[in-house]
């Protein structure tokens, strides 16, 4: 039985040209996290494997940085980065947990961030 829950940054916004940290946290389960995949729409952005470390997609190599933790940092944001992002936790023995974050990249200089995991 899957008892875990994923807490995410939820709906967040950031300025064009800036950076943002995407964070998810899996709680309420003792399952072992084997791998976390980060996806945007239908693209795989990055993989964090518990044993092997991080790999960033060649498509996003220059704009995505691993961490902090199991999170992901998106840099040099453009309006095209607006959309849904998913953290997919592969766990044993529970299976797969998925969290959703919606990022809006704003042209304006005022961008409000989500309440949790926000960048100072």
């Amino acid at each position: 039985m899957m008892t875990g829950t994923i807490e995410t940054t939820g709906n967040i916004s950031a300025e064009k040209g800036g950076s943002i940290i995407l964070q998810c946290h899996l709680s309420s389960t003792t399952a072992q996290v084997t791998q976390v995949n980060w996806e945007q729409q239908d693209q795989l952005l990055a993989i964090c494997n518990a044993d092997l470390g991080w790999h960033i997609s060649p498509s996003f190599k220059d704009r995505v940085a691993p961490g902090p933790g199991l999170g992901l940092t998106l840099q040099s944001l453009t309006v095209n980065d607006t959309g849904e992002y998913f953290c997919i936790y592969h766990t044993y023995p529970d299976g797969t947990y998925t969290g959703r974050i919606f990022l809006e990249v704003l042209e304006s200089s005022v961008a409000e961030h989500g309440a949790r995991f926000q960048i100072p």
Epitope: D42, Q43, L44, I47, L52, S57, P58
Partner: antibody, heavy 119, light 107 residues
Framework: EVKLVESGGGLVQPGGSLKLSCAAS????????MYWVRQTPEKRLEWVAY????????YYPDTVKGRFTISRDNAKHTLYLQMSRLKSEDTAMYYC????????????WGRGTSVTVSS | DIVMTQSHKFMSTSVGVRVSITCKAS??????VAWYQQKPGQSPKLLIY???ARHTGVPDRFTGSGSGTDFTLTITNVQSEDLADYFC?????????FGAGTKLELK
């Protein structure tokens, strides 16, 4: 069992066009990113195209950009490669390959379909 | 483009021995390297990904190592069915590139 079966290869004249297909079975096709890779007569492997699982994103090397188009039909579990303005240097065995769910490597390859560009 | 150099086009070996096939990247690719085996008349098969992780069903006599620019595929206790072409590939950045291959043959 993962199975990828390419078809559509053949002999074509320089400047001509050809459309390759790759029929996938044994896995949930729409969950996987896919590639086309070719192998020249000298046995060199060259990446030709990438398509994301939903078909939204595509990438190509400069050698084929603007001439080749990768696409997919998830309902038909089929990957395609439309090749136009073909050159003699496009002569090769063309393979479709699946991207691993664990990484960005190519974990399963089809048997290939041969393309010869010659007058 | 990142060039993957396999310095030995051919390597001669004997059954039961240990052989190491090397691959050098023209720039740092971290551990974004795979190794493929191709037997005559067949398509390439994934052996190693993430520079050192063995693909499902691959015998443990195949071992991948290295990071940055220098990578090695080691086959311990070579079997006759291991005689094939071996290719390295980087997937750190586009365009994805392969080494020219190393043919493992009997002495």
């Amino acid at each position: 069992e993962v199975k990828l079966v390419e078809s559509g290869g053949g002999l074509v004249q320089p400047g001509g066009s050809l459309k390759l297909s790759c029929a996938a079975s044994g896995f949930i096709f729409s969950d996987y990113h896919m590639y086309w890779v070719r192998q020249t007569p000298e046995k060199r492997l060259e990446w030709v195209a990438y398509i994301s699982k939903g078909g939204i994103s595509t990438y190509y090397p400069d050698t084929v950009k603007g001439r080749f188009t990768i696409s997919r039909d998830n309902a038909k579990h089929t990957l395609y490669l439309q090749m136009s303005r073909l050159k003699s240097e496009d002569t090769a065995m063309y393979y479709c390959a699946r991207q691993s769910s664990y990484d960005f490597a190519m974990d399963y390859w089809g048997r290939g379909t041969s393309v010869t560009v010659s007058s | 483009d990142i060039v993957m150099t396999q310095s030995h086009k051919f390597m001669s070996t004997s059954v039961g021995v240990r052989v190491s096939i090397t691959c050098k990247a023209s720039q740092d690719v971290g551990t974004s390297v795979a190794w493929y085996q191709q037997k005559p008349g067949q398509s390439p098969k994934l052996l190693i990904y993430w520079a050192s992780a063995r693909h499902t069903g691959v015998p443990d006599r195949f071992t991948g190592s290295g990071s940055g620019t220098d990578f090695t595929l080691t086959i311990t206790n070579v079997q006759s069915e291991d005689l094939a072409d071996y290719f390295c590939q980087q997937y750190s950045s586009y365009p994805l590139t392969f080494g020219a291959g190393t043919k493992l043959e009997l002495k």
